[in-house]
């Protein structure tokens, strides 16, 4: 299973959910469906209030229990570690696959924390990510901000994924807009 | 009690094609993902294929991905393998299993000129 | 194609206790906690001694018992007996290849 791993506003903007959480149990396999489950400990929730409405205590994650039909495996043995996870809902229940953002807590730039905790949200509605792949590449619309990470690094984990959110200018512009100076 | 049974094996020639069937009794067949082993005269278990209690999802052993093919039919409790371009190597016993724990007593398959 | 790592052979005398290691991966043995292992005799099905790791299925003695530590599984016959003469296979469940086994280690009751 490949995929290509989105810029972390994609991520937020794309789940239904975004959690803080520690996985702190091994994995179960449903012997019926082949999926699995991790046991999860939620310590924030920044998206997904609405979503979940009462409910509001995620104690799993659920993922393909194969590597070959994109399901998560949980390397950290650490389960004292925070994790952002990215998700969407299915029947009241958070699903990950390997493409989804899951992330060490510690692992995301001061930035990247402030754009999950407050302001990827504000781009999420009318702001797109748009990856570039390969040259030449081109906005196809003013409200698209061009990711060039991959293309100019190798790497997701480039300048704009760790520093950048893509958010409103003016009514129909989205531009590339520093979090960090945000950061009180 | 718990009982599976397989059948169709036999002796078959390099490139032929044959089907196993495993009849389930004694659980709730749909409710577990099943799957093949098998192992070859002399040697150890390997898994071959699985299936999930829907039959929706399977998964292959890279040896035979393209040429087996699993499937269930949850109505008559049976699990079946497909089993085509077979070659030498394929020879062996194939045992039918309930998930990771209950197997049935295998079906010879031999592949040989 | 061997992916769980198991001892050729093992023995003991009658009366005494044995153990087998299995060693796996983060991936299957470590990641998960379904270990089982099966007892084969010679031209027959092998037979579920332990699932889950530890679990007993009833009908098997409880000179067999089964453990784990970190990537490593283990099964332990105590009071051996002629009759436990034969291969010992452990499995476990694997996120990269769904199931995976060990070689097979020969256990020989000495005497």
């Known amino acids: 299973c490949t995929c290509v791993p989105p810029h972390p506003q994609t991520a937020f903007c794309n789940s239904d959910l975004v959690i803080r959480a520690k996985f702190v149990g091994t994995p179960e396999v449903n012997q019926t469906t082949l999926y699995q489950r991790y046991e999860i400990k939620m310590t924030k929730m920044y998206k997904g209030f609405q979503a979940l409405g009462d409910a509001a205590d995620i104690r799993f994650v659920y993922t393909p229990a194969m590597e070959s039909v994109c399901g998560y495996f949980h390397r950290s043995h650490n389960r004292s570690e925070e994790f952002l996870i990215a998700g969407k809902l299915q029947d009241g229940l958070l699903h990950i696959t390997t493409c989804s953002f899951v992330a060490p807590w510690n692992s995301l730039s001061l930035a990247q924390r402030r754009g999950f905790t407050k302001t990827y949200t504000v781009g999420c509605e009318e702001c797109t990510v748009f990856p570039c792949l390969s040259i030449p590449c081109k906005l196809q619309s003013g409200t698209h901000c061009l990711w060039t990470d991959q293309l100019l690094q190798g790497s997701e984990k480039g300048f704009q994924s760790r520093h950048l959110a893509c958010l409103p200018r003016e009514p129909g512009l989205c531009t590339w807009q520093s979090l960090r100076s945000q950061i009180a | 009690q718990v009982q599976l049974v397989e059948s169709g094996g036999g002796l078959v020639q390099p490139g032929g094609s044959l089907r196993l069937s495993c009849a389930a009794s004694?659980?709730?067949?749909?409710?577990?993902?099943m799957s093949w082993v098998r192992q070859a005269p002399g040697k150890g278990l390997e898994w071959v294929s699985a299936i999930s209690g829907s039959g929706g999802s399977t998964y292959y052993a890279d040896s035979v991905k393209g040429r087996f093919t699993i499937s269930r039919d949850n109505s008559k409790n049976t699990l079946y393998l497909q089993m085509n371009s077979l070659r030498a190597e394929d020879t062996a016993v194939y045992y039918c299993?309930?998930?990771?724990?209950?197997w049935g007593q295998g079906t010879l398959v031999t592949v040989s000129s | 194609d061997i992916a769980l790592t198991q001892p050729a052979s093992v023995s003991g005398s009658p009366g005494q206790s044995i153990t087998i290691s299995c060693t796996g991966t983060?991936?299957?043995?470590?990641?998960?906690?379904?270990v089982s292992w099966y007892q084969q005799h010679p031209g027959k099905a092998p037979k579920l001694m332990i699932y889950?790791?530890?679990n007993r299925p009833s009908g098997v003695s409880n000179r067999f018992s089964g453990s784990k530590s970190g990537n490593t599984a283990s099964l332990t016959i105590s009071g051996l007996q002629a009759e436990d003469e034969a291969d010992y296979y452990c499995?476990?469940?694997?996120?990269?290849?769904?199931?995976?086994f060990g070689g097979g280690t020969k256990l020989t009751v000495l005497g």
């Open positions: 889950d790791v530890s």
């Open positions: 004694g659980f709730t067949f749909s409710s577990y993902a």
């Open positions: 983060s991936s299957d043995v470590g990641g998960y906690n379904y």
């Open positions: 299993a309930r998930f990771l724990d209950i």
């Open positions: 499995q476990s469940y694997d996120f990269y290849k769904f199931n995976v």
